[in-house]
Amino acid sequence: IFPLAFFIYVPMNEQIVIGRLDEDIILPSSFERGSEVVIHWKYQDSYKVHSYYKGSDHLESQDPRYANRTSLFYNEIQNGNASLFFRRVSLLDEGIYTCYVGTAIQVITNKVVLKVGVFLTPVMKYEKRNTNSFLICSVLSVYPRPIITWKMDNTPISENNMEETGSLDSFSINSPLNITGSNSSYECTIENSLLKQTWTGRWTMKDGLHKMQSEHVSLSCQPVNDYFSPNQDFKVTWSRMKSGTFSVLAYYLSSSQNTIINESRFSWNKELINQSDFSMNLMDLNLSDSGEYLCNISSDEYTLLTIHTVHVEPSQETASHN
């Protein structure tokens, strides 16, 4: 498994490496092979990151922030590889690294610019606040500041509230949208331009269903092909909103193909699941089953929310008994 980092070549012996927070990266450096190899990696021309000479590491004066986080490709040094393997990068590691390589033939200096990005998987939440309904796109930790765009029925929305809190290393961002009384579909996109990573949340409201007590209801939930990739790990959760909060009825994990059902009247069709159809049945309806049902299909790259409103009405029998 290669660490997530990619190199952008720029002139004058300078390269840009983009890494992801807490992951490992490689700072590249090569030289014309020769004997008597000396390698010194420095940060911002001041701090000692890693030193190698006379055939071994010399880390006595290594800056403490790099302790146990750096190593070279020792078997490849004689082939001209002076690259630095760098563990668990943080945003404080961003900056310019200089690799000095001396041999019996020559001395070369390479510069590597390290940029670090953060993109913890965002979420799209549906919330009721009093009589208002909100969609909230949020990302707990992101760096640099992302681009957030909303669309309603595939048309961009200009109004875009962003609640932002900054910590030492990253931003936490909420973008709420009031969708009270709307039957439109909504889409929120969060883009990290540095990591070239985009996440999309999509919300769809289905037509309301009217059912009689004791009947069963079938609620559809199928991913949109544009986003859905069956090879990618995802999770499907069905939940029901009661007094402003959702309780989970069932969930399915694609990685283990496990289904967990918390409501005995809930059923999933295994064959449909294999065809990426996560529609569900709820048997033996009662009046308290009225409400909003939410299907959430989520992966690292998307969240698809489908809302069904179910109205359960008393059956004629029940009504005549009363």
Epitope: S35, V38, Y53, K54, Y100, G102, V107
Partner: antibody
Framework: QVQLVESGGGVVQPGRSLRLSCAAS????????IHWVRQAPGKGLEWVAV????????YYADSVRGRFTISRDNSKNTLSLQMNSLRVEDTAVYYC??????????????WGQGTLVTVSS | DIQMTQSPSTLSASVGDRVTITCRAS??????LAWYQQKPGKAPKLLIY???SLESGVPSRFSGSGSGTEFTLTISSLQPDDLATYYC?????????FGQGTKLEIK
Amino acid sequence: QVQLVESGGGVVQPGRSLRLSCAASGFTFSDYGIHWVRQAPGKGLEWVAVIWYDASDKYYADSVRGRFTISRDNSKNTLSLQMNSLRVEDTAVYYCARDRSSGAMGYFVYWGQGTLVTVSS
Amino acid sequence: DIQMTQSPSTLSASVGDRVTITCRASQSISSWLAWYQQKPGKAPKLLIYKASSLESGVPSRFSGSGSGTEFTLTISSLQPDDLATYYCQQYNAYSYTFGQGTKLEIK
């Protein structure tokens, strides 16, 4: 071609100070570590001090530690050795010598012609 | 400090002779050893580094061998120009130390 030229030697009394200089040319000075090595008249060679290419590391022989200070100015391609509290036994020809690379290797590829320091009352 | 002991202190040989100078370290220095030649009134000149690597521009009649604590400098066929004092130097650890020198005279 690589050239190292020492200067600043002379006769000085014990306890006094002297500053030696080494002017470098013919190579990228800021890429290389430089050492001072001395040789008492009719005696063998003795390593004195080293300064790394970027001046990040400086090391001294026990016999001079605390009295001598090595420094460099990469913008002027010059090396200096500030010698304080001089003793009679510091009398020697002082050579500046270029390391193989950063200063970390510790052997001397190019040498200057030397400058004589005589400590005598 | 690591002590370096050279033998012999003086050596007299004829042109064309094979000459060997020995250097012993007081503790192991792996192969971190250099040999220098110093002619009268001149600065030393690097001959060999890393015990056996010949410095660029040095005649191939010079060779070095050894590792650990025992090292030798060999001149395969002595030339008049080789009249000099030869020094070994360890660069395994600070402080770097030299042998006391071997003065080579031509018979």
